[in-house]
């Protein structure tokens, strides 16, 4: 970040595969980070035929693709995985799809949790 | 530094069982899962499993599930990973990998090595 | 499972060329996937992850580039210790997979 001290964030968390994986299902995730590292949060998802599936959520690793994003926009035009990343304490909330060869845009909002966090 | 040693290397008899350790060093040893890849000579690298220091937990590869057994020792920052019913094809190189504590998880720690042979 | 195509499966080339080396997932993988170099005898080090970010202290001739399924690593000005066999690597789901390898070789 520049900022020289250790970057901490917190992200919402998602893992759709998390029996397999052996994680936690959903809940926030804090995010520490090392010295002058960025930490991001992210979203993934299908989309199909207009039925979202959540793929996973959570912190991501300092990524320049990320930077000064201050919400978590998709912008692949058809993509099997659609990912956006932002920076902020839970901006993958939510997510959005808004193609860079234009159409419509596409925001998914995600309903009430109580969400706990994780260790 | 962050670092990942491993034991030497072994010369083992079809049927039998091999156990390699992996110590890490200067890092939290329960923030980081550890992973075990293996590289058979001559031959590309394949991802074998994990393990979360943490709470224990694994899952290993469709391939070696049954013969596999990772386990890990937070009191000494040791993982291990057991490969029982040993045949010639699992002579190899194992690495112990660490894991980025967050997505996309990139294995960005790797021990030296335990060459494992296995032969009649 | 996911399979990982890495071509061309070896590279010669020449100190100072630009080197190409792709990448395509059987599905797609967004942006989990990683680079790793390795040198005869030694370990696979960590070059880029989440397909295009530099990992520390990685020499910034290394790029990465791609989404979904199809990647590339490019070397834009190849040194002579970067002769060495190169692999991709997606994490986007278990069981983790490797693409073949590609060695870059001197010319």
């Known amino acids: 970040s520049g900022r020289g001290e250790a970057e901490t964030r917190e992200c919402i968390y998602y893992n759709a595969n998390w029996e397999l994986e052996r994680t936690n299902q959903s809940g926030l995730e804090r995010c520490e980070g090392e010295q002058d590292k960025r930490l991001h949060c992210y979203a993934s998802w299908r989309n199909s035929s207009g039925t979202i599936e959540l793929v996973k959520k959570g912190c991501w690793l300092d990524d320049f693709n990320c930077y000064d994003r201050q919400e978590c926009v998709a912008t692949e035009e058809n993509p099997q995985v659609y990912f956006c990343c932002c920076e902020g304490n839970f901006c993958n909330e939510r997510f959005t799809h808004l193609p860079e060869a234009g159409g419509p845009e596409v925001t998914y909002e995600p309903p009430p949790t109580a969400p706990t966090l994780l260790t | 530094q962050v670092q990942l040693v491993q034991s030497g290397a072994e010369v083992k008899k079809p049927g039998a069982s091999v156990k390699v350790s992996c110590k890490a060093s200067?890092?939290?040893?329960?923030?980081?899962?550890m992973h075990w890849v293996r590289q058979a000579p001559g031959q590309g690298l394949e991802w074998m499993g994990f393990?979360?220091?943490?709470?224990?937990?694994?899952g290993y590869a469709q391939k070696f599930q049954g013969r596999v057994t990772m386990t890990r020792d937070t009191s000494t920052s040791t993982v291990y990973m057991e490969l029982s019913s040993l045949r010639s094809e699992d002579t190899a190189v194992y690495y112990c990998?660490?894991?980025?504590?967050?997505?996309?998880?990139?294995?960005?720690?790797w021990g030296q090595g335990t060459t494992v042979t296995v032969s009649s | 499972d996911i399979q990982m195509t890495q071509s061309p499966s070896s590279v010669s080339a020449s100190v100072g060329d630009r080197v190409t080396i792709t990448c395509r997932a059987s599905?797609?993988?967004?942006?989990?996937l990683a680079w790793y170099q390795q040198k005869p005898g030694k370990a696979p080090k960590l070059l880029i992850y989440?397909?295009?970010s530099l990992q520390s202290g990685v020499p910034s001739r290394f790029s990465g580039s791609g989404s979904g399924t199809d990647f590339t690593l490019t070397i834009s000005s190849l040194q002579p210790e970067d002769f060495a066999t190169y692999y991709c690597?997606?994490?986007?789901?278990?069981?983790?997979?490797f693409g073949g390898g590609t060695k870059v070789e001197i010319k």
């Open positions: 599905q797609g993988i967004s942006r989990w």
């Open positions: 990998a660490r894991v980025s504590r967050y997505a996309p998880e990139p294995m960005d720690v």
């Open positions: 393990i979360v220091p943490s709470g224990g937990s694994t």
């Open positions: 200067g890092y939290t040893f329960t923030s980081y899962r």
């Open positions: 690597q997606q994490a986007f789901s278990h069981p983790w997979t």
């Open positions: 989440a397909a295009s």
